[in-house]
């Protein structure tokens, strides 16, 4: 039910990467506005993006309070200029989102190779530990801080002169690989959470090759 010129939101979708989390929906509003509610850990509904004409709402501040919690949101539709108006059943039209558990579902952002250093026939490759918007004790946690050992990285590396790729894995943000002396290598990394059933892998990092600025060489 609801007023005749108000339509319910649909296609509610969570878009989340490294815990930056936005709820999106349709349709673009015509003579109506939207308000979002998100359930907190006490199962109370908290209002966000009140009276917006956008079709998205940034809920990051709410979900980072407990990334292991399973959240539910809903989008309420009101006639434009009357956010207090309700339908014939005494409440606005609304549509529920799918449930969303940030720890299990946020996409892993594209990682970045922070540095690589060659010492003889070994190369140390370090992956940048990206900061998230998750806080603990007033500090922002890194991806590693949040996921711990659930997060691994896979390194793909190959000689610049060939296409045959090798792989290495690590439970930290560092690799130490054997290379042939006098050969240049290229590197790309991918973040993986093996225990997940969805969104297990990030996209590959940009490729970095020896002989470029990020690298360092020591005999």
């Amino acid at each position: 039910s609801g007023t005749t010129n108000t339509v319910a939101a649909y296609n509610l979708t969570w878009k989340s990467t490294n815990f930056k989390t936005i709820l999106e929906w349709e349709p673009k509003p015509v003579n109506q506005v939207y308000t979002v509610q998100i359930s907190d850990r006490s199962r109370n509904w908290k209002y966000k993006c009140t009276g917006t004409t956008d079709t998205e709402c940034d809920l990051t501040d709410e979900i980072v309070k407990d990334v292991n919690w399973t959240y539910e949101a809903r989008v309420l539709s009101y006639p434009a200029g009357n956010v207090e108006s309700t339908g014939s059943a005494g409440e606005p039209l609304y549509e529920n989102s799918p449930e969303f558990t940030p720890y299990l579902e946020t996409n892993l952002g594209q990682p970045t190779i922070q540095s690589f250093e060659q010492v003889g026939t070994k190369v140390n490759v370090t992956v940048e530990d990206e900061r998230t918007l998750v806080r603990r004790n007033n500090t922002f946690l890194s991806l590693r801080d949040v996921f711990g050992k659930d997060l691994i990285y896979t390194l793909y590396y190959w000689k610049s002169s060939s296409s045959g790729k090798k792989t290495a894995k690590t439970n930290t943000n560092e690799f130490l690989i054997d290379v042939d002396k006098g050969e240049n290598y290229c590197f790309s990394v991918q973040a993986v959470i093996p225990s997940r059933t969805v969104n297990r892998k990030s996209t590959d990092s940009p490729v970095e090759c020896m002989g470029q600025e990020k690298g360092e060489f020591r005999e």
């Epitope: 890194s142 801080d145 711990g148 290495a168 894995k169 690590t170 439970n171």
Partner: antibody, heavy 125, light 108 residues
Framework: QVQLQESGPGLVKPSQTLSLTCTVS?????????WSWIRQHPGKGLEWIGE???????RYNPSLKSRVTISVDTSKNQFSLKLSSVTAADTAVYYC??????????????????WGKGTTVTVSS | EIVLTQSPGTLSLSPGERATLSCRAS???????LAWYQQKPGQAPRLLIY???TRQTGIPDRFSGSGSGTDFTLTISRLEPEDFAVYYC?????????FGGGTKVEIK
Amino acid sequence: QVQLQESGPGLVKPSQTLSLTCTVSGGSISSGQYWSWIRQHPGKGLEWIGEIYYSGSTRYNPSLKSRVTISVDTSKNQFSLKLSSVTAADTAVYYCARDAPYYYGGGYYYYMDVWGKGTTVTVSS
Amino acid sequence: EIVLTQSPGTLSLSPGERATLSCRASESVDSSYLAWYQQKPGQAPRLLIYGASTRQTGIPDRFSGSGSGTDFTLTISRLEPEDFAVYYCQQAGVVPYTFGGGTKVEIK
């Protein structure tokens, strides 16, 4: 040289909460390692309880998860175990351990390389 | 959970003999996460081998580890008196981390 020392009551009554603390000396608890609790029932094998990172990130054994809380206090260089609603089946030697990264096959993986001496906890009325 | 089954339960051998301990997993274990521990009575376990085959610093070279997938082996080439103890394999790749039931190496 990192050393670990468990402390806490040796006797806990059924239905109460078992609380143990592990004090880390000779190194910082915030230095990129994980910190684990393991127990060993009398005359039996080892059972992993759970682990914590200095950031507070935890992993628990699902068989105990509903009763276990592991926390860390970086200011005191300590981490703690709480096990609620204990029964006689929780009588065991409880060990704390450091999980440190070791190089293997191009990457680094964590192994429990430093252990406390263990503390015996008996659950009895 | 991954169940690790160790055999034999007890191994009775004399000093100088070779000990072969088996650890079989209920499903494939990445070698990177396979470790062996030694435990003597009244003591905490001690890390011997990690990555299925790499000796921890200070562990004598008479200890060696091998295997992959579901079958892993710890070999003590020549038993010394101080080697008589209980040995556990452990996997730390899948939660819950699990230990085998142990193999007791006793003096014959």
